[in-house]
Amino acid sequence: AYGPGETLCGGELVDTLQFVCSDRGFYFSRPSSRANRRSRGIVEECCFRSCDLALLETYCATPAKSE
């Protein structure tokens, strides 16, 4: 289970992204509109320091459908 303020690395990070993003898919790096971040991606944001669910969701490929 994923709790707030955890670090996620490797297979655990992939599994969590697959769960959070479901059939939407996900990116390891956000599209280049955030070019000022340069190489920083989900690995740096969530493995090298703790991150939350909201941040994880920003790496999903398409926005969640609103009910």
Epitope: T7, L8, C9, G10, G11, E12, L13, V14, F28, S29, R37, R38, S39, R40, G41, V43, E44, C47, F48, R49, S50
Partner: antibody, heavy 119, light 112 residues
Framework: QVQLQESGPGLVKPSETLSLTCTVS????????WSWIRQPPGRGLEWIGY???????NYNPSLKSRVTMSVDTSKNQFSLKLSSVTAADTAVYYC?????????????WGQGATVTVSS | QSVLTQAPSVSGAPGQRVTISCTGR?????????VHWYQQFPGTAPKLLIY???NRPSGVPDRFSGSKSGTSASLAITGLQAEDEADYYC???????????FGGGTKLTVLG
């Protein structure tokens, strides 16, 4: 327990490409992050880059134009190529692994491969 | 010049407590990125000593401890032993450089 072993030529000529391979045993290459680090004689550690098997890579900006990292999942190996080498690239090269149980710390290291750049 | 600054050397007598500091900035340690510490003996590969600022991998004695505050981190060694004589490196991630960074290393000498 994951174990790493570097291999490659110990001597490379200036302007040529340095090529090293890291063989992984005791774990799957598709589960972890993989790094290369080097240490020039008598100096400190320098991060070269890391990658995830999916293709996600990040290289040291000072070396980025010369570095390529790749993975061969069938052989459970990953490799480093550093082009246009000079004497300043003489170092012990280490491959290392971030298994994910150590919050991004490199918890498994190879024993190191000494590479000398000389004509 | 390393992005993470460490004193080149530190020394202490057996049984004493020594601390090794690692000073960063707002783009690395101060940005919340974890600090890791490595121990390296001459001619051997580094070994992870402390991860995630203050956690010890299994097998590392509890004489070794890590802490982090603001833009700095520290490694403390209590009950210093002759076999602790080695080089110690801190490591973190730097968002302005978009990469991992190491400190320059601190050589620990155990006196006597």
């Amino acid at each position: 327990q994951v174990q790493l072993q570097e291999s490659g030529p110990g001597l490379v000529k200036p302007s040529e490409t340095l090529s090293l391979t890291c063989t992984v045993s005791g774990g799957s290459i598709s589960s972890y992050y993989w790094s290369w680090i080097r240490q020039p004689p008598g100096r400190g550690l320098e991060w070269i880059g890391y990658f995830f098997y999916s293709g996600y890579t990040n290289y040291n900006p000072s070396l980025k134009s010369r570095v390529t990292m790749s993975v061969d999942t069938s052989k459970n190996q990953f490799s480093l190529k550093l082009s246009s080498v000079t004497a300043a690239d003489t170092a012990v090269y280490y491959c290392a692994c971030i298994t994910g149980t150590t919050k991004g710390g490199m918890d498994v290291w190879g024993q190191g491969a000494t590479v000398t750049v000389s004509s | 010049q390393s992005v993470l600054t460490q004193a080149p050397s530190v020394s202490g007598a057996p049984g004493q407590r020594v601390t090794i500091s690692c000073t960063g900035r707002s783009s690395n340690i101060g940005a919340g990125y974890d600090v890791h510490w490595y121990q390296q003996f001459p001619g051997t590969a580094p070994k992870l000593l402390i991860y995630g600022n203050s956690n010890r991998p299994s097998g590392v004695p509890d004489r070794f401890s890590g802490s982090k505050s603001g833009t700095s981190a520290s490694l403390a060694i209590t009950g210093l032993q002759a076999e602790d004589e080695a080089d110690y490196y801190c490591q973190s991630y730097d968002s302005s450089l978009s990469g991992s960074v190491f400190g320059g290393g601190t050589k620990l000498t155990v006196l006597g």
